[in-house]
Amino acid sequence: MGARRLRVRSQRSRDSSVPTQCNQTECFDPLVRNCVSCELFHTPDTGHTSSLEPGTALQPQEGS
């Protein structure tokens, strides 16, 4: 696996946080510059899950 090293040192452009197209259960992680499994949030007062939006005071679900 180590042979497929991501050369992050040479790819630190300012667009590193621009998301690529990920599938429905994933999101783009700028740290690893790839799509990763992404969890939804749990809104304590409603019990609903949602995508995290800026400014919302949500807590993540316990564990995964």
Epitope: R4, L6, V8, C27, P30, L31, V32, V36, E39
Partner: antibody, heavy 125, light 107 residues
């Protein structure tokens, strides 16, 4: 229950090698990045390396590059840190940790949510 | 690499005090900052991620703020179990880097 358990630490002479293991349970490592972080006695946290097992991407701290190799075996749900050419300054408690991501408008908002208990590596003659 | 400069390196406070710890990044990292608490002999625990989001199970007396280069962790009313060392970490660009830590001690 999510759990990470490190093993493989011990006493080794300068120039020697060790292989640390990080056995995960309660989640599949292929879906997250797995990180090694170390802490020298009385010092702060120092990130060492990460691996994204789903694609094999890796990165390393400059202080270990060329000496340490991070890898993962998804069939065993285990990550590894192969440490070669060890130096006295590599003496530390080594932790593995999972990076969790929450969906923030399609981009990861996250941190290292689960950590192992740590394994001590002592490099001394 | 992005440097995370944390201040103060240590502080003394009493139970009930409001405590503020700051972290400055050497370049713009948006809101990609997490805060951790560590007690002696234990692994770190995630408190805050994405600069201002409280991790599950963390008491609401902890809060985070900031974006760009300046970030703050606040403990609104210090409790006995909060005496520990706190670290910030950026995760915008690899390598992820930690601040040097802030030790919160009993006055």
């Amino acid at each position: 229950e999510v759990q990470l358990v490190e093993s493989g630490g011990g006493l080794v002479q300068p120039g020697g090698s060790l292989r640390l293991s990080c056995a995960a349970s309660g989640f599949t490592i292929s879906s997250s990045s797995i990180h090694w972080v170390r802490q020298a006695p009385g010092k702060g946290l120092e990130w060492v390396a990460w691996v994204l097992p789903s694609v094999g991407f890796t990165d390393y701290a400059d202080s270990v590059k060329g000496r340490f190799t991070i890898s993962a075996d998804t069939s065993k749900n285990t990550a590894y840190l192969q440490m070669n050419s060890l130096r006295a300054e590599d003496t530390a408690v080594y932790y593995c940790a999972r990076r969790v991501c929450y969906n923030r408008l399609g981009v990861c908002a996250g941190g290292m949510d689960y950590w192992g208990q740590g394994t001590l590596v002592t490099v001394s003659s | 690499d992005i440097q995370m400069t944390q201040s103060p390196s240590s502080l003394s406070a009493s139970v009930g005090d409001r405590v503020t710890i700051t972290c400055r990044a050497s370049e713009d990292i948006s809101t990609a900052v997490a805060w951790y608490q560590q007690k002696p002999g234990k692994a770190p625990k995630l408190l805050i991620f994405a600069a201002s989001y409280l991790y599950s199970g963390v008491p609401s007396r902890f809060s985070g703020s900031g974006s760009g280069t300046d970030f703050t962790l606040t403990i609104s009313s210090l409790q006995p179990e909060d005496f520990a060392t706190y670290y910030c970490q950026q995760s915008q660009i690899s390598p992820p880097t930690f601040g040097q830590g802030t030790k919160v001690e009993i006055k």
